[in-house]
Interface confidence: low
Amino acid sequence: DSSKWVFEHPETLYAWEGACVWIPCTYRALDGDLESFILFHNPEYNKNTSKFDGTRLYESTKDGKVPSEQKRVQFLGDKNKNCTLSIHPVHLNDSGQLGLRMESKTEKWMERIHLNVSERPFPPHIQLPPEIQESQEVTLTCLLNFSCYGYPIQLQWLLEGVPMRQAAVTSTSLTIKSVFTRSELKFSPQWSHHGKIVTCQLQDADGKFLSNDTVQLNVKHTPKLEIKVTPSDAIVREGDSVTMTCEVSSSNPEYTTVSWLKDGTSLKKQNTFTLNLREVTKDQSGKYCCQVSNDVGPGRSEEVFLQVQYAPEPSTVQILHSPAVEGSQVEFLCMSLANPLPTNYTWYHNGKEMQGRTEEKVHIPKILPWHAGTYSCVAENILGTGQRGPGAELDVQYPPKKVTTVIQNPMPIREGDTVTLSCNYNSSNPSVTRYEWKPHGAWEEPSLGVLKIQNVGWDNTTIACAACNSWCSWASPVALNVQYAPRDVRVRKIKPLSEIHSGNSVSLQCDFSSSHPKEVQFFWEKNGRLLGKESQLNFDSISPEDAGSYSCWVNNSIGQTASKAWTLEVLYAPRRLRVSMSPGDQVMEGKSATLTCESDANPPVSHYTWFDWNNQSLPYHSQKLRLEPVKVQHSGAYWCQGTNSVGKGRSPLSTLTVYYSPETIGRR
């Protein structure tokens, strides 16, 4: 049953004399393994014998007989799948049909393969894309329907006979589907490649030429142009004439339109290959080119830079930077349209020529206020001198200058006055917007240039102001020199160092902390009575009568200041003691009599002692001696003694008379 044999292999194989052929082949015999294989050349079926006749190139049988031809032909297959064959070398007369006679135990099959062997190596075939455009990458393919393991070959690309630089990718196929060798070349053709010959050359392993295929490149491209100008350097003066000519060196396909452009903008009504410019003006300076279009697109020539020369135009000045800060650096740039460029410049400051400044730029490394003003310049080239433009203003900014603090009041200033100060300055840029004052007082301090100090203090010594724009400038402090009455007047005891005892020598000092003006007078007062006009008050021998409240006054031309009252205390032993009797010095017996020891002492008496007419001390120590009931025997003279920390004093005798009561007299 022939349907059981399935073969796969290329239908036709190609080779040339002396090369080799490799026939990839697979089969399937479902009923069993291959028993016998014969390779026929141009087999013919003989009906009489029911066998195939023809040249046997290879035979594999059970008995193992191998014809001599088998050295050239090799069966590389197996008994159930592979039927690959190799013929090496292959000859011209091997062309025709190869018949593979396959036999298994029960089945037979004849499979035919075409072999085309040429006398010489046949050429490869170059495949091109349908259209090639300049600068667009294309792939060129060179295909050869040949590949054989025993005969290595190579495909080389040539452009106008010269090997191409681009790397080609070669691939081979030896499969049951196809047998070929292919070379692919990626290539970005330029317009100059148009019409050039590309060759794919087949070479053997040693690089020997075998065959080739050639094609002519048809590279579509925009028109390629050349521009010519008279005069050739394209430098003219106003009023001259200029001619430009456009030549097409290549175009594929043919060009259709022509136009001219200046600085990228199309010139109207200029559609010929010649551009005539008559009596040119400086505005016609610029970059000219011609543009020619075809179906691919527009092509442009190189640009011609037409320079129409003219004298400098009125100049302008650019300042880097204004406003400028005093002490900073500033650069001035003179800008003037001219062709050729100016070679010399003249600079002016406030209309006056700046000597030695001939460059396009003027650099001032350290700006001062007097540099402010208008800067202008004049440019000059070979065709003439330009006009001076309007100029530019340099604004120089600086802190307020010569700041002074000025006292507006008539002098002298007295404590308690309202003082007005102003902050003055000579110049400032930008203008002063605020003021600062030092020290920071409790007064209301405006941000303005006038400071009012209400009720000025005696201790306000110096004031300074600052005028501020972007910076603050401080004035030197001014002294207010406030005049005031003497301050902190007080009485101070100089001697004795300890407490004052009666009889001591005593000195009191009138002190004050400060006075402006310094010339002062002193006054001492006790109980409203003037005692002296010196700074000290002296007592040679103090007596208790000198004790009391003392004040001193210090005055100057502004006013006088009193001290606080100072109490002078004199310590003395008890004195002027006397015994007083109540209700009197004559008392009736049985009544009550009180004796009081009166004294003058500082400090007060701390201890009393009572004595009778016999100088006998009585057991009583208080200031009062109470006799109740009083008896006639109590009659007599009494005296008392007082004691303090300074000493003792005694009273004179005082007599108490106690008389009998009527009752007593009645009883007698």
Epitope: Q397, P430, T433, R434, H440, P446, L448, S470
Partner: antibody
Framework: EIQLQQSGPELVKPGTSVKVSCKAS????????MYWVKQSHGKSLEWIGY????????RYNQKFKGKATLTVDKSSSTAYMHLNSLTSEDSAVYYC??????????????WGQGTSVTVSS | DIVMSQSPSSLAVSVGEKVTMSCKSS????????????LAWYQQKPGQSPKKLIY???TRESGVPDRLTGSGSGTDFTLTISSVTAEDLAVYYC?????????FGGGTKLEIK
């Protein structure tokens, strides 16, 4: 970018003191005066005073003399406000504000995020 | 010290409405030397630091929308918002920097209905 980063919230006892800091970045610390502003809860703003970091000069609102002391540490670009003898009246948010007078005499200003001080026993 | 008084203390408006708030100073803030009014307006949104909107009484800080306009001279000043948006919810303070100590107004609280 100019920033003023103030110290975190403070809870302190009456009679004690507190020091609020304000760290400046993104500019020359000595060019801007550092102002301090008080905002009591739900109330308006009160100007405490300022310090000039360049020379340490200070100016106080009379109301805050003796209460607030302003100082700076130039090396760390930080301004400080020390509040003493604290009472509940001092509970507030305190802001630092950097002010620079430009060419026009107009004050550019940048504010800190504020520091909350709460005085409670 | 210069006393700054603002009115009203609060107001509630709908989005799109026009609003004006007033600020009065106890003495003139106009400096004759440069004819500038030393007055600024600040906006303080909830939980944020104050932000300066206007200085010299009428000059807008960069980035401040032209819906906000400052006007006035001497002692009477006004801040106007021509068409209120939800973004404008804040307290607005005026401040004088004519004389030390600088002082602020009590503020006007703007609420959105």
């Amino acid at each position: 970018e100019i920033q003023l980063q103030q110290s975190g919230p403070e809870l302190v006892k009456p009679g004690t003191s507190v020091k609020v800091s304000c760290k400046a970045s993104g500019y020359d610390f000595t060019r801007y005066n550092m102002y301090w502003v008080k905002q009591s809860h739900g109330k308006s703003l009160e100007w405490i005073g300022y310090i000039d970091p360049y020379n340490g000069d200070t100016r106080y609102n009379q109301k805050f003399k003796g209460k607030a002391t302003l100082t700076v540490d130039k090396s760390s670009s930080t301004a400080y406000m020390h509040l003493n003898s604290l009472t509940s009246e001092d509970s507030a948010v305190y802001y630092c504000e950097a002010i620079y007078y430009d060419m026009e005499g107009y004050a550019l200003d940048y504010w800190g995020q504020g520091t909350s001080v709460t005085v409670s026993s | 010290d210069i006393v700054m008084s603002q009115s009203p203390s609060s107001l509630a408006v709908s989005v799109g409405e026009k609003v004006t708030m007033s600020c009065k100073s106890s003495q003139s803030l106009l400096y004759s030397n440069n004819q500038k009014n030393y007055l600024a307006w600040y906006q303080q949104k909830p939980g944020q630091s104050p932000k300066k909107l206007i200085y010299w009484a009428s000059t807008r800080e960069s980035g401040v929308p032209d819906r906000l306009t400052g006007s006035g001279s001497g002692t009477d000043f006004t801040l106007t918002i021509s068409s209120v948006t939800a973004e404008d919810l804040a307290v607005y303070y005026c401040q004088q920097f004519y004389s030390y100590p600088w002082t602020f107004g009590g503020g006007t609280k703007l609420e959105i209905k």
